[in-house]
């Protein structure tokens, strides 16, 4: 028989982690495996049909994506949809596919809302999601004794699809669910100078453990401002929510692993400021299959899609599409073996959820509501050379923090700063306001 | 030939102004006129096909509506879409129809965004829209000498589709465009007691001319709180943005025209508080055709839709659908006469825009970007008997304020309070901070 996979992803713009130029080769590799493995859909042909989630400007669109999905549904009646990745594109498509009772598989759509499976029925996320970042941060807070207060700052940048809004939303909601903690959040515009003034005034009043989602440049700017204002590593800790590790990559931007370096006359100050900084990224898979997969992926991207794929965590996304597609085909195979059909979306989806799978991204666990357990890394600066390195990993499946041997978190005072200052944010603790002579009474 | 009108409106829930139980009879009356008039689409049959914009709970839905539109498009290839009315339902449908180059005609979708016709191409709004409310308020400010500052409060109520958010958005943006004025805006939850405390603290610091979009009950509560806090009519004016005149209707709620009355032991205070209040509504058409139309509409609603239609401004919406549909059919007739076809959406739409039309709602003007010029009424209290009555009308076409003869706006001091207090909001005017003896020097 024929199984049709309807792809709704950016076909022209290559800059998204889920652009077809990146995901296409991963799908090719997955389908090559299906052909090669007699245990997967024997006697079946799997074909892909393509629709674009972009508008004419190459930007993800909440109009283009559902229109593409509708066209593909009417013309090809696919068994499954692959993508979209962008939040605003995925939302209407996911609601449509839920209505049609057709499975949707993506390694994007990381926003909190897609976890609500009565709205997004049959949507499986084989990639990372922002609520899972909340699981990691909650575990970190428990480990470090921060159970009372945190502050989250998130940047708005025109044209970035409110990435940071959605990231902080997922993080915020999940952390609040997991811990009985006060979390304040504040948006700022990266290119608005006056917003930095406001942040500078707000930070000391609202938090000591501060999460920042922004571009590497904006994070560095905030660290310099914090240093200038005396918000130092003894009292504060700043986590850069840099999930794809952009600030650690080098290239045109910062030196590899030295996110404070720019060559702008402020590097000495910036290095000092970054002693109060830690960086949170997705975890790079370290299994040998992943490295082999990347080699093939890059080769295929160049040969068939004329696209040169850079290194970096961004490649975990096509890899997750690959693993998700194989998991889906495994589930279809089993459904058919049990007398079902490829149109039995509910049954197929149930076989994907609450299931483990060994993929090119390593051990992969889809939770009971269809979302992948996600691994994260925490990076800290080596005070010797100023380079950042992973000091701690989080295993999403076991929900454990795993220290990297021989490395530990660097705290200027030898221990983490408290999440609420000794005398409270406004010196409101009565014990701190007594006359100094009172100890003599 | 056949002309198919695809309706996407709430088919089950009768509570929306654009529910099919209300709009259906208006469409019937329009189509009866088309049949009766030899100058409109001679030899053609107009038929309606129905799709629902509601979800299973009967609530407007941004999923159900575009899915209905898609089904209607594929099955019937309609010449025009009628509806949706709800903002969240109309948004995706309007983007889809723009992509399909099929005209969309509605008397709902009043939010600011639908005025952006490169996104909502071929969307014609034959009903009122919130930006037009901004035109009225700007004219009012010019007339009353308020050119510096205003405050807008808007209520959030679960399940009301953020009506007040969209209303204040349209008002705010248009007033800012029309006047060089500072406008602050503040959201509050009607059922959260702490929010009223916050509003009470904020109002004196932020405004003297205050617009409030909320339920009649919440507005009355705010007026009582304002009175209690000494925010009286000599210094403040509170405009209730009650576009459908709910607070003026009587019935189970307030006595007709006495929006302060509840019989809860606070009516004396409420009446006093409402001396600082004015109410803004759509204008009730006063042409004889409208009254005749309403009679037929109610009869048909009861006979064919088993629905008892109440009186009130809400009926201007079905009436506007009626007029809009006739205008559309007029435009199609002309397009055919000039050798065009019913699928020539661009041409048909251009014949509707920048055009006047005599309808059951009176003189109707569609502006150059396809939105109807809207008339408003300003209601004020008669100090003699406490009843509110229209003192001023705004003609959207001429953009003029027209006083009702023999009535004038009631100001406790005999003139409108200034929009910025004499010494500034925080007494910041240096002239007010001098030692009182300084006049003796």
């Amino acid at each position: 028989g024929n199984l049709t996979v309807a792809v709704v992803l950016p076909l022209a713009n290559t800059s998204y982690p889920w652009s077809w130029a990146r995901v296409g080769p991963a799908v090719e590799l997955a389908l090559a495996q299906v052909k090669a493995r007699p245990d997967l859909l024997p006697g079946w042909t799997v074909r892909t049909v393509l629709g674009s989630s972009e508008n004419a400007l190459g930007v993800c669109s909440d109009t283009a994506a559902p229109l593409a999905a509708v066209d593909l549904k009417w013309e090809h009646n696919p068994a499954v949809f692959l993508g979209p990745g962008c939040v605003y594109a995925a939302a209407p498509v996911g609601r449509f596919t839920a209505h049609w009772r057709v499975p949707l598989l993506t390694a994007g759509a990381p926003a909190l809302g897609f976890g609500v499976k009565d709205e997004y029925a049959l949507t499986t996320r084989a990639g990372p999601s922002y609520a899972k970042l909340g699981d990691f941060v909650a575990a970190l807070h428990r480990r470090l004794g921060w159970e009372r207060q945190a502050l989250m700052l998130y940047a708005y940048r025109p044209g970035d699809e409110e990435h940071c809004f959605f990231l902080v939303e997922g993080l915020f909601m999940r952390v609040r669910d997991r811990l009985n903690i006060t979390v304040d959040h504040l948006e700022f515009a990266e290119d608005d100078l006056s917003h930095y003034t406001r942040l500078l005034r707000t930070m000391p009043r609202k938090g000591r453990v501060i999460y920042i989602c922004s571009s590497p440049d904006a994070f560095r700017t905030l660290m310099l401002l914090a240093l200038e204002a005396g918000l130092c590593g003894e009292d504060y800790v700043f986590f850069h929510l840099d999930i794809f590790g952009q600030s650690l990559q080098g290239g045109q931007g910062p030196a590899p692993r030295r996110p404070w370096e720019r060559g702008d006359g402020q590097d000495v100050s910036a290095r000092q400021a970054f002693q109060a900084a830690k960086i949170i990224t997705y975890k790079d898979p370290d299994n040998p299959e992943y490295l082999e997969f990347l080699k093939q992926l890059k080769h295929l991207a160049y040969e068939q899609f004329n696209f040169t794929m850079e290194d970096g965590l961004v490649n975990t996304i096509p890899a997750s599409f690959h693993d998700g597609l194989l998991l889906y085909i495994q589930a279809v195979t089993e459904t058919l073996a049990h007398g079902g059909t490829v149109t039995d979306g509910e049954n197929i989806t149930q076989r994907m959820w609450n299931r483990s799978f060994q993929g090119v991204t390593g051990y992969l666990k889809i939770d009971s509501s269809g979302d992948r357990e996600t691994d994260f890394s925490l990076w800290d600066m080596d005070p010797e050379n100023g380079a950042f390195r992973v000091v701690l990993n989080y295993n999403g499946t076991s929900q454990e923090l795993v220290a990297v041997s021989g490395r530990k978190l660097n705290w200027p005072l030898g221990y983490p700063p408290p999440d609420i200052p000794k005398c409270g944010f406004d010196n409101e603790d009565p014990a701190c306001n007594q006359d100094h002579l009172s100890t003599l009474e | 030939g056949n002309l198919t009108v695809a309706v996407v409106l709430p088919l089950a829930n009768t509570s929306y102004p654009w529910s099919w139980a209300r709009v259906g009879p208006a469409v019937e009356l329009a189509l009866a006129q088309v049949k009766a008039r030899p100058d409109l689409l001679p030899g053609w049959t107009v038929r309606t096909v129905l799709g629902s914009s509601e979800n299973a709970l009967g609530v407007c839905s941004d999923t159900a509506a575009p899915l209905a539109a898609v089904d209607l498009k594929w099955e019937h290839n309609p010449a025009v879409f009628l509806g949706p009315g709800c903002v969240y339902a109309a948004a995706p449908v309007g983007r889809f129809t723009a992509h399909w180059r099929v005209p969309l005609l509605t008397a709902g979708a009043p939010a600011l965004g639908f005025g952006v016709k490169d996104e909502y191409a071929l969307t014609t709004r034959a009903g009122p829209s919130y930006a037009k409310l901004g035109d009225f308020v700007a004219a009012l400010h010019r007339r009353l000498g308020w050119e510096r500052q205003a405050l807008m409060l808007y209520a959030y109520r679960p399940g009301d589709e953020e009506h007040c958010f969209f209303l204040v958005e349209g008002l705010f943006m248009r007033v800012r465009d029309r006047l060089n004025i500072t406008v602050d805006h503040l959201e509050f939850a009607e059922d959260d007691l702490s929010h009223y405390t916050r509003l009470l603290r904020t109002m004196p610091r932020k405004g003297r001319v205050i617009y409030i979009c909320s339920s009649p009950d919440a507005f009355r509560t705010l007026m009582l709180l304002a009175l209690e806090a000494g925010l009286c009519g000599e210094d403040y004016v509170f405009f209730h943005l009650d576009i459908f005149g709910q607070s003026l209707q009587g019935g189970q709620g307030p006595a007709p025209r006495r929006p302060w009355e509840r019989g809860d032991g606070q009516d004396v205070s409420a009446r006093q508080a409402f001396q600082a209040a004015k109410i803004i509504t759509y204008k009730d058409p006063d042409n004889p055709e409208y009254l005749e139309f309403l009679k037929q509409l109610k009869h048909l609603a009861y006979e064919q839709f088993n629905f008892t239609m109440e009186d009130g401004l809400v009926n201007t919406i079905p009436a506007s659908f009626h007029d809009g549909l006739l205008l559309y059919i007029q435009a199609v007739t002309e397009t055919l006469a000039h050798g065009g076809t019913v699928t020539d959406g661009e041409n048909i739409t251009q014949r509707m825009w920048n055009r006047s039309f005599q309808g059951v709602t009176g003189y109707l003007k569609i502006d150059s970007s396809g939105d109807r010029e809207t008339d408003f009424s300003l209601w004020d209290m008669d100090p003699e008997n406490g009843a509110f009555r229209v003192v001023l009308n705004y003609n959207g076409t001429s953009q003029e304020l027209v006083a009702v003869s023999g009535r004038k706006l009631n100001w406790p001091l005999g003139y409108p309070p200034p929009d910025i207090p004499k010494c500034g909001f925080d007494n910041e005017d240096p002239a007010c901070n001098q030692d009182h003896l300084s006049t003796l020097e």
């Epitope: 100078l193 930095y196 200038e228 005396g230 045109q252 702008d264 006359g265 402020q266 | -």
Partner: antibody
């Protein structure tokens, strides 16, 4: 009205010192970084020094480093440039300028300028 | 330090002409470049910040573009009051540095 007024310029011999002041009004002084920029007669603009809102960062051009000291007094809405070991090549019109941002770590342009005070270094 | 090089150093043009001034940075400065206009005997005035943001009150005939190392100031239709010296300035690093200026004269 937003205004910057420089003072303290004059004729001074090489090797001597001079202190320039800049009085700010019409804006919240401690919300902005401030700068000194100079212009030698008939020449272009040269950035001399800049200071963040709370004096947390102070930067200098190489040509004045070690000789000039910039400071500010937020309570008095005032900016200062202490110029020691003056040289003939320091002769210029000295402008005080307001940054659009709070800090030198930001990228603010200079949106308000004073009219300048003339410093002449000559024996 | 970051060097800023403007070209040309001077130009003659007539009222109504389109005028283009370029500025090159010695290293990548993102979009952190500002343009100033200075008339004789007056303090400089900022026209454009962050490469392309027109400051309020500045006529729309002025526009800026560029990022990285190469930037352009364009005056679409030169007016009599536009004859002045124009400076670029980088705000990427410390020390801040100006270009040497471009004098726009009447032809």
């Amino acid at each position: 009205e937003v205004q910057l007024v420089e003072s303290g310029g004059g004729l001074v011999q090489p090797g001597r010192s001079l202190r320039l002041s800049c009085a700010a009004s019409g804006f919240t002084f401690d919300d902005y970084a401030m700068h000194w920029v100079r212009q030698a007669p008939g020449k272009g603009l040269e950035w001399v020094s800049g200071i963040s809102w709370n004096s947390g960062t102070i930067g200098y051009a190489d040509s004045v480093k070690g000789r000039f000291t910039m400071s500010r007094d937020n309570a008095k809405n005032s900016l200062y440039l202490q110029m020691n070991s003056l040289r003939p090549e320091d002769t210029a019109l000295y402008y005080c300028a307001k940054d659009m941002g709070v800090s030198l770590a930001l990228w603010g342009a200079f949106d308000i300028w004073g009219q300048g005070t003339m410093v002449t270094v000559s024996s | 330090d970051i060097q800023m090089t403007q070209s040309p150093s001077s130009l003659s043009a007539s009222v109504g002409d389109k005028v283009t001034i370029t500025c090159r940075a010695s290293q990548n400065i993102r979009t952190y470049l500002n343009w100033y206009q200075q008339k004789p005997g007056k303090a400089p005035k900022v026209l454009i910040s962050t490469a392309s943001s027109l400051q309020s009150g500045v006529p729309s005939r002025f526009s800026g573009s560029g990022s990285g190392t190469d930037f352009t100031l364009t005056i679409s239709s030169l007016q009599p009051e536009d004859f002045a010296v124009f400076y670029c300035q980088q705000s990427f690093g410390i020390p801040r540095t100006f270009g040497q200026g471009t004098k726009v004269e009447i032809k």
